[in-house]
């Protein structure tokens, strides 16, 4: 049962932060106008992934598209490519998971496909994840430079009459966004890994021999490691109730599907 | 097309407060415009007083900001500019006006005239 | 406050000739994020309210006809009326309106020569 909601969690949690991941990618706030000292501004600017866009206290909004690719900085780019792998890899890794489902049959696949593809589906969650956490962090650390480079250059033309204020650019909401569901994304892949310990049958990778000693009912068995996943050992030292020598074989029942819940 | 009318008083007395009222015609006070307060002393140039915007935010011209208040009645597609203590250098003609694209006033009512005196 | 300086004070320009406004303001009025200067212009004829004929300092409202141009970017901006007619006759202001409070220029009253 808690293998069942351990991968059940994972997926919702990834779920909910792949959604994130998509809902920052296309978000036009990934840096906005930094207000300082004026909370209140008739011209407010914020940027995106895709676009820029300007906001006038009267009203009018107006998004213009970067419609070069090759004039674009390289770091945009880059911010541009974690997010879209991870849009991809999280996408990939919810569809093996729908079917990696313990509570999804299909025909008679066997619990050890089961495993794997929650292993999968994990381990993509868990790159999805990280590409956003990076995406969203390397387009950050471009805004903190930015930030002291134009706090630097402040006002220009300060000797003679006229005066510019330079716009500066603070963390926009699709940063935090960003942060979260990558996050989420992350934790939900970790469940599905640890749902996978759960969800492997218990088998040997070799055949374990049991030995009878004189005077003893006794049966002495190695730990054997779960072969298809690597993880845990077999804890499980059976009695054998009869005389001679036997391999584990001929004596272990193995688990059917059917007694996991 | 958005049409603005402006009523009120036409003759205040010092230190009296100043009321007056637009009212928008052709176009919702909700919609994504400003409504703004502008004002034209006899012989003079335009001063903005301040503005309520489509979302109820105001701002005001630091020269004026103690004195005024702008509000909005969205019932009866009405805004209202209220001047406290008013002195004879407050006599202009007051203009209520709609801003969108560029933030410049694209619709102009046909202007008041307050007269400050006792 | 951003200051706003028309010059001339006043124009008397010949019928069908070319009337040049001049509008300086003491911060730039160019908004980086979209490149566009916040800068309008506005025709006043006597007991009428101001009539919008030039928005971003360089677009035309619409019905406004196409002899009236406007130019410049940053701090220097003009309007040009390119062929003056008799209904230009009118007091003409630029306004900025990039940053609170927006301003008004005091003025340029066009006359007939």
């Known amino acids: 049962m808690a293998v069942t909601a351990c991968q059940g969690l994972g997926f919702v949690v990834s779920l909910i932060g792949i959604a994130g991941i998509i809902a920052a990618t296309c978000m036009d706030q990934w840096s906005t106008q930094d207000l300082y000292n004026n909370p209140v501004t008739a011209v407010f600017n914020y940027q995106g992934l895709w676009r820029s866009c300007v906001r006038e206290s009267s009203g009018f909004t107006e998004c213009r598209g970067y419609f070069t690719l090759l004039g674009l900085p390289a770091m945009l780019q880059a911010v541009r490519a974690l997010m879209i792998v991870g849009i991809v890899l999280g996408a990939i890794g919810l569809l093996v998971s729908i079917f990696a489902l313990k509570c999804i049959r299909i025909g008679s696949m066997e619990d050890s496909a089961k495993a794997n593809m929650t292993l999968t589906s994990g381990i993509m969650f868990i790159v999805s994840g990280l590409c956003a956490i990076a995406g969203v962090s390397v387009f950050a650390n471009m805004l903190v430079t930015n930030f002291w480079m134009s706090t630097a250059n402040m006002y220009t033309g300060m000797g003679g009459m006229v005066q510019t204020v330079q716009t500066r650019y603070t963390f926009g909401a699709a940063l935090f966004v960003g942060w979260v569901a990558g996050g989420l994304t992350l934790i939900g892949g970790v469940m599905m890994c640890i749902a996978c310990r759960g969800l492997a049958p218990e088998e040997t990778n070799y055949k374990a021999v049991s030995y009878h000693a004189s005077g003893h009912s006794v049966a002495y068995k190695p730990g054997g490691f779960k072969a298809s996943t690597g993880f845990g050992s077999n804890t499980k030292n059976k009695k054998i109730y009869d005389g001679g020598a036997r391999t584990e074989d001929e004596v272990q029942s193995y688990p059917s599907k059917h007694d996991y819940v | 097309q958005v049409q603005l009318q402006e009523s009120g008083p036409g003759l205040v007395k010092p230190s009296e407060t100043l009321s007056l009222t637009c009212t928008v015609s052709g176009g919702s006070i909700s919609s994504n415009y400003a409504w703004n307060w502008i004002r034209q002393p006899p012989g003079k140039g335009l001063e903005w007083i301040g503005y309520?915007?489509?979302?109820?935010?105001?701002a005001y011209n630091p020269s004026l900001k103690s004195r005024v208040t702008i509000s909005r009645d969205t019932s009866k597609n009405q805004f209202s500019l209220k001047l406290s203590s008013v002195t004879a250098a407050d006599t202009a003609v007051y203009y209520c006006?709609?801003?969108?694209?560029?933030?410049?006033?694209?619709?102009w009512g046909q202007g008041t005239l307050v007269t400050v005196s006792s | 406050d951003i200051v706003m300086t028309q010059s001339p004070d006043s124009l008397a320009v010949s019928l069908g000739e070319r009337a040049t406004i001049n509008c300086k303001s003491s911060q730039s009025l160019l908004n980086s994020g979209n490149q566009k200067n916040y800068l309008a212009w506005y025709q006043q004829k006597p007991g009428q309210p101001p009539k919008l004929l030039i928005y971003w300092a360089s677009t035309r409202e619409s019905g406004v006809p196409d002899r009236f141009s406007g130019s410049g970017s940053g701090t220097d901006f003009t309007l040009t009326i390119s062929s003056l007619q008799a209904e230009d006759v009118a007091v003409y202001y630029c306004?900025?309106?990039?940053?609170?409070?927006?301003?008004f220029g005091q003025g340029t009253k066009v006359e007939i020569k």
């Open positions: 309520i915007n489509y979302s109820g935010n105001t």
């Open positions: 006006a709609t801003s969108y694209y560029g933030n410049s006033f694209i619709y």
């Open positions: 306004q900025q309106a990039y940053s609170f409070p927006w301003t």
